[in-house]
């Protein structure tokens, strides 16, 4: 038995920040689990980890230097990534492991989300032109 994961196909981080919601075919209420977000086609970089425990506060951390936070829903974990760089544009995969109570469950690999990080514009945007010359 595998948990199914749904993610948005693509997200654009205009302000170098993005909310990526991982929706699971499994209710996480009163479970102990480890949800994580991985970067790259080979999922080589573990961007952010959320440990959920029925009796404790959510633990959120990154061992790879990402600025991240996490929010828990009954059947979802939302990762909030900040201070992203343009060169961190990539595909990101949600992963979930439910440890307790047994049995252990993990997910089928999802399709992933392409996060496109737009750089901060140094020149005025066409929608908000600067003061016009007289």
């Amino acid at each position: 038995n595998k948990i199914l994961v749904k993610q948005s196909p693509m997200l654009v981080a205009y302000d170098n920040a993005v909310n990526l919601s991982c929706k699971y075919s499994y209710n996480l209420f009163s479970r102990e689990f480890r949800a994580s977000l991985h970067k790259g086609l080979d999922s080589a970089v573990e961007v952010c980890v959320v440990y959920g425990n029925y009796s404790q506060q959510l633990q959120v951390y990154s061992k790879t230097g990402f600025n991240c936070d996490g929010k828990l829903g009954n059947e979802s974990v939302t990762f909030y990534l900040q201070n992203l760089y343009v060169n961190q544009t990539d595909i990101y995969f949600c992963k979930i492991e439910v440890m307790y109570p047994p049995p252990y469950l993990d997910n089928e690999k999802s399709n992933g989300t392409i996060i496109h990080v737009k750089g901060k514009h140094l020149c005025p945007s066409p929608l908000f032109p600067g003061p016009s010359k007289p």
Partner: antibody, heavy 120, light 111 residues
Framework: EVQLVESGGGLVQPGGSLRLSCAAS??????????VSWIRQAPGKGLEWIGE???????YYSPSLKSRVTISRDNSKNTLYLQLNSLRAEDTAVYYC????????????WGQGTLVTVSS | DIQLTQSPSSLSASVGDRVTITCRAS??????????LHWYQQKPGKAPKLLIY???SLQSGVPSRFSGSGSGTDFTLTISSLQPEDFATYYC?????????FGQGTKVEIK
């Protein structure tokens, strides 16, 4: 045949560190369906669970030891490791690795254990 | 953490006796109809050996004189006819929640 063999025990100074190994054979540490825990037993006392590692490499630790313990593995050697820091006399124990199945999490195979003595 | 309390802590019995050991959990260890409570036997200088898993299932190779019962918070290990090789210490263990915990043990001695 499934086998677990611990090594690395011995005399350690208080405040020091230990690194124990658990060589697994008869199954792969990286194959889904089984994980391995470390469990210890102080002389004349009961069994205490230290932590575990899943096939994915994810780890879970006892809250009372979490700040001092790291469980890792080397897939190429099919070997599990236990690192315990800031050792004190009460860490003196026989340390076991034990395999568990993913359905019931019962420990179906155990190593023979390795004795760690923390003393100056 | 889930506390497991075994009783008695020790007992003296003779070969052929029926022996019963109980294990009480501080909260239910049941989930979807399964009790995540297991029993182990340990002899001096040896590693523990799994006897019963999921409260009542006999581990492969374990003699049928060993049986387990119970659900929720109250569990029992029974040895129907004690044999010389059964003199040992018995532990219950829960795997319902982390951290996994063990009972303090019950030592079965020769009368």
């Amino acid at each position: 045949e499934v086998q677990l063999v611990e090594s690395g025990g011995g005399l350690v100074q208080p405040g020091g560190s230990l690194r124990l190994s658990c060589a697994a054979s008869g199954f792969s540490l990286s194959t889904s369906g089984v994980g391995v825990s470390w469990i210890r037993q102080a002389p004349g006392k009961g069994l205490e669970w230290i932590g575990e590692i899943y096939h994915s490499g994810s780890t879970y630790y006892s809250p009372s030891l979490k700040s001092r313990v790291t469980i890792s593995r080397d897939n190429s050697k099919n070997t599990l490791y236990l690192q315990l820091n800031s050792l004190r006399a009460e860490d003196t124990a026989v340390y076991y690795c034990a395999r568990y199945g993913y359905y019931y999490y019962d420990f179906d195979y155990w190593g023979q254990g390795t004795l760690v003595t923390v003393s100056s | 953490d889930i506390q497991l309390t075994q009783s008695p802590s020790s007992l003296s019995a003779s070969v052929g006796d029926r022996v019963t050991i109980t294990c009480r959990a501080s909260q239910s260890v049941d989930f979807h109809g399964i009790s995540f409570l297991h029993w182990y036997q340990q002899k001096p200088g040896k590693a523990p050996k799994l006897l019963i898993y999921a409260a009542s299932s006999l581990q492969s190779g374990v003699p049928s004189r060993f049986s387990g019962s119970g659900s929720g918070t109250d569990f029992t290990l029974t040895i129907s006819s004690l044999q010389p090789e059964d003199f040992a210490t018995y532990y219950c263990q829960q795997s319902y929640r982390s951290p996994r915990t063990f009972g303090q043990g019950t030592k079965v001695e020769i009368k």
